[in-house]
Interface confidence: low
């Protein structure tokens, strides 16, 4: 299908456009271009006959058009009036007609815009400012930029007049910025120069520095005043209501107690007509006053809060000292002093940080101490402990359980049996228990200040029969001559005797065997391979007895010095050499061989067929136990004699 493509579609005045023809049929007689959406002889631009290669201008020809043999039409020096549709009329050789229409739009090149303003010095929180982007241009889009960024969303910003006007309602000092406008159309975009909005504001409430209000007699008083203001504020000082001077700084040398009083700074903005004042009370001491400690957090939570303790009052040129627990500050990453030593910060307080804390101010003769301050650190509850530790009871006895958890403020306790709440007490007492009292006993500790809760669960079994005990070990694979092993007979039961057997016999007397914890724990010091035996524990009371399954101790040992067999060291040439290495070790060691220092295979047996005198040398067997981390080796010399010589055998 015959189509027309305009390149470009949007054309700037003065530039050129190409109406490009696609799918032009073959065997043509000629073609003709018309202005508009149809073939109209009065609006013909140009015609072209292929046979004669003759171009004939029409009534709408302006002299700016060029027709190409491929039927494309170039229009130069585009004017606004060229906007619109163009129709190509193609006459084929069989005189059958075909038509196609294309179009383009013409836009002016935009001039550089400028910004006009209705108020060059607006007052903060009072005035509005309207910026207008000049000139007004048809078919143009208007954009605004603040500090080279697009407009922020704000109820105080309003665009109007087709975005040509930007209004800022109730201007603030933060509106002091660089404003630009931009005009755009499809063929050009131009930005204005910056306009800086000069917002008059202030003065704000002045700030008097330094902040300290306590001074010693004989010092110089040097106060400075500052208030945010545009234009900059004019300053006046008053002492006890009496005007002193119109300066930003007030300097009084060698002050005395008589210079104590109220010091007022007044800031005045001549453009806004506003005044603001700030008063500070200055105290001049003949000697430093007794210091006192202030805290930013009187009830800090352990491991969560930091506490800043400040020594008051703040006095210039003074040395501040601190003590904790009546001693100077320890070195700790959690204790931090400010540059002037006046503030002591405890990062991430712990329950051990309660104090007492004292600060001191150094004077000429001595140190004035503050009263001690104690921190009330909220902590816990920690995991509760249920005592006693027994888990087995006989029917008929009284069950008395007590729960305790470290906590500040003290924890509130609750008891649950098998998940059911029983009572809100620290102690649980049940008299004359039966098997039905067996179950899961939970103590819950709650700290009302921190909101934290912790629980501990204990299984209580009430039974006339003792359970079958079991043995727990603190080390399942001890290393010989190095480790100790502690066997514990579980469970812990009330009024119960604990017994031990080794390989079915009662414990031998040995300084390396020790019973503790009411005979519940058997400790073997410096285990040896001979301790690899079956251990059984038993429990008994007045009505029953029971034994555990045996536990065999797996002692890791070795490797011992290896033995190479056979012991022969002299061989005849042509014989087979078959050396075997063995070392006592648990677990079995890894073996490797070296001949004259050169590594060989990693096997227990070294086999060399038909040896010759070249095989003379030192044969070393290396053993390694990965579990104990120990190594060992042995070296054997082998002599091979040429056959015919009779070797002397030696071990």
């Amino acid at each position: 299908k015959l189509t027309i493509e305009s390149t470009p579609f949007n054309v700037a005045e003065g530039k050129e456009v190409l109406l490009l023809v696609h799918n032009l049929p073959q065997h043509l007689f000629g073609y003709s271009w018309y202005k508009g959406e149809r073939v109209d002889g009065n609006r013909q631009i140009i015609g072209y006959v292929i046979g004669t290669q003759q171009a004939t201008p029409g009534p709408a020809y302006s002299g700016r058009e060029i027709i190409y043999p491929n039927a494309s039409l170039l229009i130069q020096n585009i004017i606004q009036n060229d906007t619109g549709f163009y129709t190509l009329h193609v006459i084929k050789s069989d005189l059958v007609n075909e038509e196609a229409t294309g179009q383009f739009r013409v836009y002016p090149e935009l001039p550089k815009p400028s910004i006009s303003s209705n108020n060059s010095k607006p007052v903060e929180d009072k005035d509005a400012v309207a910026f207008t982007c000049e000139p007004e241009t048809q078919d143009a889009t208007y954009l605004w930029w603040v500090n080279n960024q697009s407009l922020p969303v704000s109820p105080r910003l309003q665009l109007s007049n087709g975005n040509r006007t930007l209004t800022l309602f109730n201007v603030t000092r933060n509106d002091t910025a660089s404003y630009k406008c931009e005009t755009q159309n499809p063929v050009s975009a131009r930005r204005s120069d910056s306009v800086i909005l000069n917002v008059l504001y202030g003065p704000d409430a002045p700030t008097i520095s330094p902040l300290n209000t306590s001074y010693r007699s004989g010092e110089n008083l040097n106060l400075s005043c500052h208030a945010a203001s545009n234009p900059p504020a004019q300053y006046s000082w008053f002492v006890n209501g009496t005007f002193q001077q119109s300066t930003q700084e007030l300097f009084i040398p060698n002050i005395t107690v008589n210079n104590s009083g109220s010091y007022t700074c007044q800031a005045h903005n001549s453009d806004t007509g506003l005044n603001r004042t700030t008063v500070t009370t200055i105290t001049v001491y003949a000697e430093p006053p007794k210091p006192f400690i202030t805290s930013n957090n009187s009830n800090p939570v352990e491991d969560e809060d930091a506490v800043a303790l400040t020594c008051e009052p703040e006095i210039q040129n003074t040395t501040y000292l601190w003590w904790v627990n009546n001693q100077s500050l320890p070195v700790s990453p959690r204790l931090q002093l400010s540059n002037d030593n006046r503030t002591l910060t405890l990062l991430s307080v712990t329950r051990n940080d309660v104090g007492p804390y004292e600060c001191g101010i150094q004077n000429k003769l001595s140190v004035d101490h503050s009263d001690p301050v104690i921190l009330n650190v909220l902590y816990g509850p920690d995991d509760p402990t249920i005592s006693p530790s027994y888990t087995y009871y006989r029917p008929g006895v009284n069950l008395s359980l007590s729960c305790h958890a470290a906590s500040n403020p003290p924890a509130q306790y609750s008891w649950l049996i098998d998940g059911n709440i029983q009572q809100h007490t620290q102690e649980l007492f049940i008299s004359n228990i039966t098997e039905k009292n067996s179950g899961l006993y939970t103590c819950q500790a709650n700290n009302s200040a921190s909101g934290h809760s912790r629980t501990t669960v204990k299984t209580i079994t009430v039974s006339a029969e003792l359970p079958k005990p079991s043995i727990s070990s603190n080390n399942s694979k001890p290393v010989e001559d190095k480790d100790a092993v502690a066997f514990t007979c579980e469970p812990e039961a009330q009024n119960t005797t604990y017994l031990w057997w080794v390989n079915g016999q009662s414990l031998p007397v040995s300084p390396r065997l020790q019973l503790s914890n009411g005979n519940r724990t058997l400790t073997l010091f410096n285990v040896t391979r001979n301790d690899a035996r079956a251990y059984v524990c038993g429990i008994q009371n007045s009505v029953s007895a029971n034994r555990s399954d045996p536990v065999t101790l797996d002692v890791l040992y070795g490797p011992d010095t290896p033995i190479i067999s056979p012991p022969d060291s002299s061989y005849l040439s042509g014989a087979n050499l078959n050396l075997s290495c063995h070392s006592a070790s648990n677990p079995s060691p890894q073996y490797s061989w070296r001949i004259n220092g050169i590594p060989q295979q990693h096997t227990q047996v070294l086999f060399i067929a038909k040896i010759t005198p070249n095989n003379n040398g030192t044969y070393a067997c290396f053993v390694s136990n990965l579990a104990t981390g120990r190594n060992n080796s042995i070296v054997k010399s082998i002599t091979v004699s040429a056959s015919g010589t009779s070797p002397g055998l030696s071990a």
Partner: antibody, heavy 121, light 111 residues
Framework: EVQLQQSGAELVEPGASVKLSCTAS????????MHWVKQRPEQGLEWIGR????????KYVPKFQGKATITADTSSNTAYLQLTSLTSEDTAVYYC??????????????WGQGTSVTVSS | DIVLTQSPASLAVSLGQRATMSCRAG??????????LHWYQQKPGQPPKLLIY???NLESGIPVRFSGTGSRTDFTLIIDPVEADDVATYYC?????????FGGGTKLEIK
């Protein structure tokens, strides 16, 4: 004198695991935190995580969660970094550094010499 | 996570001149008004070396040619005068909150 001795360079295959050690002398690691930092070739420093050897509590950057495990053995005064399912992205030098008790204001004043891990088939 | 942006990425300074490099934090790294921002020097094949801790404190053994300033989000490391031995990459690190992030580094070279 504070010193940190890291284990030797490692050449490992993709998919394998490696465990690096950092043995401290001149201080007790229970009194501080032990941190691990990664530095890929020609790249910057990247914090992996830390452990409090006194209680075994460890903390990791989310991107190393599941990749790195930091442990400590106070009896040998040693911290460990285990890296699993290794890929070429794990090829880097890994540094250990104590942080806290022996260091002014929470900075890393002491560093191990670094362990180079190369992941290659 | 607190992002630390160091600029410039590389810096060429003549011997005896002043080198200034910046570290900008995505949010304040101050604790009680103290910047928990530290500066390290790293030479090829070596671990980092602490120069400045807590924004402006000179680590013991570090020459006074090195100094640090800044608070909250903007921090600066100054080397004045620069010596040949100062050729290295300089990193900033914040320890205000986990994770303890490092900046991307500034590489110092001699003109």
């Amino acid at each position: 004198e504070v010193q940190l001795q890291q284990s030797g360079a490692e050449l490992v295959e993709p998919g394998a695991s490696v465990k690096l050690s950092c043995t401290a002398s001149g201080f007790n690691i229970k009194d501080t935190y032990m941190h691990w930092v990664k530095q890929r070739p020609e790249q910057g420093l990247e914090w992996i995580g830390r452990i409090d050897p006194a209680n075994g509590n460890s903390k990791y950057v989310p991107k190393f969660q599941g990749k790195a495990t930091i442990t400590a053995d106070t009896s040998s005064n040693t911290a460990y970094l285990q890296l699993t399912s290794l890929t070429s992205e794990d090829t880097a030098v890994y540094y250990c550094a104590p942080f806290g008790y022996y260091v002014s204001d929470y900075a890393m004043a002491y560093w191990g010499q670094g362990t180079s891990v190369t992941v290659s088939s | 996570d607190i992002v630390l942006t160091q600029s410039p990425a590389s810096l060429a300074v003549s011997l005896g001149q002043r080198a200034t490099m910046s570290c900008r934090a995505g949010e304040s790294v101050d604790i009680f008004g103290v910047g928990f921002l530290h500066w390290y020097q790293q030479k090829p094949g070596q671990p980092p070396k602490l120069l400045i801790y807590r924004a402006s404190n000179l680590e013991s053994g570090i020459p006074v040619r090195f100094s640090g300033t800044g608070s909250r989000t903007d921090f600066t490391l100054i080397i004045d005068p620069v010596e040949a031995d100062d050729v290295a990459t300089y990193y900033c690190q914040q320890t205000n909150e986990d994770p303890y992030t490092f900046g991307g580094g500034t590489k110092l070279e001699i003109k």
